[in-house]
């Protein structure tokens, strides 16, 4: 029997009946065995076929077989009801080998020319399967020359049989207090040859409850307990299962915080699997009872491990743990069924005793000593000498625990000294230097340092003076001895004040004229205002109308008198303002340099002389009465003048304060 070519030789060729294309002889039997490489099959087709036709091809025939299976028995020229001729059909081996047998019987009624066939090896597409046949691969099949391979979807791994996809279904850990888990692909059929392990791992103190839901379908056996596929549930206490079949297992209360679920499948079957809904429970904590004036949130039927509640107080009440305030309070239920902290109180907000108001007082409106939520107090300033600044003084204890004004301010009101009060009345007449009486010049300040000088009290902790009077002490403010509330220069009865800082106008140049001859002294403590110590007012914008030429101002001080000595008693003089040009001209003659009188100065005095301020008065205030407010204000600061005080044709020169209001305000607000 001739053999066809064997792999690895090229597998293709031609077969023909003996004597082809002539007629074939009787009693012939010829067999060809064709072998292709593994993963290939043989394809055969006929280009000529002419054999004796007989019933069921019993006489002459070509038989095609592959392994034990006969693929076709062929005869005749065309197919009939009971016989088959190849026609244009192509035949394929079932594996990699194909046997072809030709036989002719002892006679032919007429000559037959036999057959001619061609064959070739071709790749088998193992991925194509006939309807109803099991697929080659579980998931994805990939054909290639001489073979195929299988691959799996994400979440699966190829089994060692190279065809089945086993689920990668182990190592999943569920840590939430409730959840769902199911067999892979549920509710579609679960994968074969898989071993799945699921863990539920909750915090100690929880107990897992398992409920099988929807449907349950795991391959079973009528006699043996779950021999094929099974589901097992294991806790640290006991094992449940195995489970299989079609009946939903009952609820399992594990009494454990850890559960392992194992699901094993074999290589066969088509079942939908299972789904578990798990919940958890724990020892409940005592039901939280809200404190008076508070409420619990969230409200639950019960509170178990890890559950929490918060306490919220009504408006006007605050969370307190004893004396310690809390902005928020949350308690958490512990595994032993106790809360992790005790219930706080919702105590009525207490703003506490109101702060003392300097130079003022406070009155309890709601009731004596009542300082709790919505209580009202009234601040007021000491009458006559103090007035309340931008506030009505009414404060309410608000929910945040602060006394709050009607304007929403939490800071104390300010009792500002009333300025410009004087016991003196002026008739506007010019008269000689007079002794001051108590309360006439309560703003008068005596400054003792290297020399005697003066100043005027502003507010209750500033002194306005001349730069030249305190220049030497600008770096040693504490060297200034500041006295007020006295008329007698040498009296031991006075109010002592000390300087914290000296601010000399940056435009002042010492020993080079007196332009910008102005300074402020900040006191290290506020002074108490009374009839003998009262600040002078600063000029209003409209003040110029009270400081025109010939308007009367008053200068006061302990400076040199006509006798050439410092005055023992505070003296004052009423003097008119001098026309600025007239004053400028008076000081343009030698020995005075040109430009001695600047726009920052004003002059006052009599052309005839005799009324003037003098050495020792430096820094003191030249004051004017504002007839609209009936308050005295500082228009000038004693600065300089002729060598001989009160000289005819010469005038006292004063720093023009109205030019320096922004400078004064800036210093005071900044410091």
């Amino acid at each position: 029997t001739p053999l066809g070519p064997k792999w690895p030789e090229p597998v293709f060729g031609r077969l023909a009946s003996p004597g082809f294309p002539g007629e074939y002889a009787n009693d012939q039997e010829r067999r060809w065995t064709l072998t292709a490489p593994p993963g290939y099959r043989l394809r055969l087709y006929f280009t000529h076929f002419d054999l004796e036709l007989s019933h069921l091809c019993e006489y002459d025939f070509v038989k095609l077989s592959s392994g034990a299976k006969v693929l076709a028995t062929l005869c005749g020229q065309e197919s009939t009801d009971t016989e088959r001729a190849p026609g244009k059909d192509t035949f394929y081996s079932l594996g990699s080998s194909l046997d072809i047998t030709f036989r002719s019987d002892y006679s032919n009624e007429k000559p037959f020319t036999g057959f001619e066939a061609f064959y070739a090896a071709e790749d088998i597409d193992e991925c194509q399967v006939a309807p109803g046949e099991a697929p080659t691969c579980d998931h994805h099949c990939h054909n290639h020359l001489g073979g195929f391979y299988c691959s799996c979807r994400a979440g699966y791994v190829l089994h060692r049989n190279k065809r089945t996809c086993s689920a990668l279904c182990s190592g999943q850990v569920f840590t939430q207090r409730s959840g769902e888990l199911s067999s892979p692909e549920y509710p579609r059929p679960y994968p074969k040859l898989s071993s799945c392990t699921y863990s539920i791992s909750l915090e100690e103190g929880f107990s897992v409850i398992l409920d099988f839901v929807e449907s349950f379908d795991v391959e079973t056996h009528p006699e043996t307990l779950c021999p094929y596929d099974f589901l097992k549930i294991q806790t640290d206490r006991e094992e449940h299962g195995p489970f299989c079949g079609k009946t939903l297992p009952h609820r399992i209360e594990t009494k454990s915080n850890t559960v392992t679920i194992t699901f094993v499948t074999d290589e066969s079957g088509d079942h939908t699997g299972w789904k578990i809904h798990y919940t958890s429970t724990a020892q409940p904590c005592p039901y939280p009872m809200a404190p008076p004036n508070g409420h619990v949130s969230p409200v639950q039927a019960k509170y178990i491990l890890k559950d929490s509640f918060s306490i919220f107080c009504e408006t006007g009440y605050e969370l307190l743990q004893g004396h310690l305030p809390l902005k928020s309070f949350t308690a958490v239920c512990q595994k032993d069924g106790s809360w992790d902290r005790p219930m706080p109180a919702c105590s009525i907000v207490d703003c506490g005793p109101p702060d003392d108001l300097p130079s003022g007082r406070v009155e309890y409106i709601t009731g004596p000593g009542v300082t709790t939520y919505k209580a009202v107090i009234q601040y007021s300033c000491e009458e006559t000498f103090y007035t309340m600044k931008v506030n009505d003084g009414k404060y309410v204890c608000e929910a945040d625990g602060f006394w709050t004004s009607s304007k929403g301010e939490k800071s104390l009101p300010v009792c500002e000294p009333v300025c410009g009060l004087s016991a003196r009345t002026t008739g506007g007449r010019i008269y000689g230097g007079q002794k001051a009486k108590p309360g006439d010049f309560p703003w008068q300040v005596l400054i003792l340092g290297g020399t005697t000088a003066a100043g005027a009290l502003l507010y209750d902790n500033w002194v306005l003076t001349a730069a030249h009077a305190v220049y030497e002490q600008k770096h040693d403010a504490s060297a200034l001895d500041i006295r007020m509330g006295t008329l007698k220069r040498l009296s031991p009865h006075y109010t002592q004040a000390w300087s914290e800082a000296v601010f000399i106008h940056e435009g002042y140049t010492h020993d080079a004229g007196f332009d910008n001859d102005i300074a402020l002294i900040k006191l290290n403590n506020k002074v108490v205002i009374n009839s003998n110590i009262t600040p002078i007012c600063l000029p209003r914008k409209e003040a110029e109308s009270f400081m025109r030429t010939d308007d009367i101002g008053t200068a006061s001080g302990w400076g040199l008198t006509q006798r050439g000595f410092l005055a023992r008693n505070l003296m004052y003089v009423d003097i008119p303002i001098v026309d600025h040009q007239k004053c400028t001209a008076a000081y343009e003659k030698p020995p005075y340099p040109r430009g001695s009188v600047t726009a920052n100065m004003l002059c006052a005095g009599l052309e005839s002389g005799g009324k003037d301020s003098c050495r020792g008065d430096s820094g003191g205030a030249l004051v004017f009465l504002d007839s609209e407010t009936e308050r005295w204000f500082v228009g000038g600061i004693v600065s300089w003048g002729s060598m001989n005080c009160g000289e005819a044709g010469q005038y006292g020169v004063y720093t023009k304060v109205i030019n320096y209001i922004p400078w004064i305000e800036n210093i005071i607000s900044d410091f």
């Epitope: 004396h323 305030p325 809390l326 902005k327 506490g352 625990g401 602060f402």
Partner: antibody, heavy 115, light 107 residues
Framework: EVQLQESGPGLVKPSQTLSLTCTVS?????????WNWIRQPPGKGLEWIGY???????SYNPSLKSRVTISRDTSKNQFSLKLSSVTAADTAVYYC????????WGQGTTVTVSS | DIQMTQSPSSLSASVGDRVTITCKAS??????VAWYQQKPGKVPKALIY???YRYSGVPSRFSGSGSGTDFTLTISSLQPEDVATYYC?????????FGQGTKLEIK
Amino acid sequence: EVQLQESGPGLVKPSQTLSLTCTVSGYSITSDYAWNWIRQPPGKGLEWIGYISYSGRTSYNPSLKSRVTISRDTSKNQFSLKLSSVTAADTAVYYCAVLYALDYWGQGTTVTVSS
Amino acid sequence: DIQMTQSPSSLSASVGDRVTITCKASQNVDTNVAWYQQKPGKVPKALIYSASYRYSGVPSRFSGSGSGTDFTLTISSLQPEDVATYYCQQYNSNPLTFGQGTKLEIK
């Protein structure tokens, strides 16, 4: 992690004002709780000075109230202690601390009152 | 002010002993009491708050009890590292006050 750190001069002259600052990290002083100052004289027990709460309200030990001011700077997450007119009896280790539900203390700073 | 009186002022015990320190308040402080441990040269460390609640990280051998005026700190099995001074503190009312301290030593 919540941390508190005291800072300030270790030597203060009698009659002057003792000033200390506590810098808090890891927690905002406006979020909750009372932020306390506590002191411990050498070889003695602990004495509470006062606190400033999350809202800025203060509470002082009545025995020190006339001399104590506790304030805060929320932008720097700091709170401060000022104790005026100090004497040798104010020599101590000064701690800042948050008490009760949170319990964290600074390392303490030794302040000596001496001329 | 509420006085917090601790007893004993000092005590000596052996490793493994059960140790009890008491604290008596001069008036009712509810359960607003804390216990502190201070080792020499160290910062006080809170052990217990609200009379019986242990701070996280505090060994379970430390426990607190009491309410009103009488409070107890118990160390169930004394360890060498427990050598320290222990303070009770009330935070029920202003001023917050501490006990005078109990010095604990190992025999």
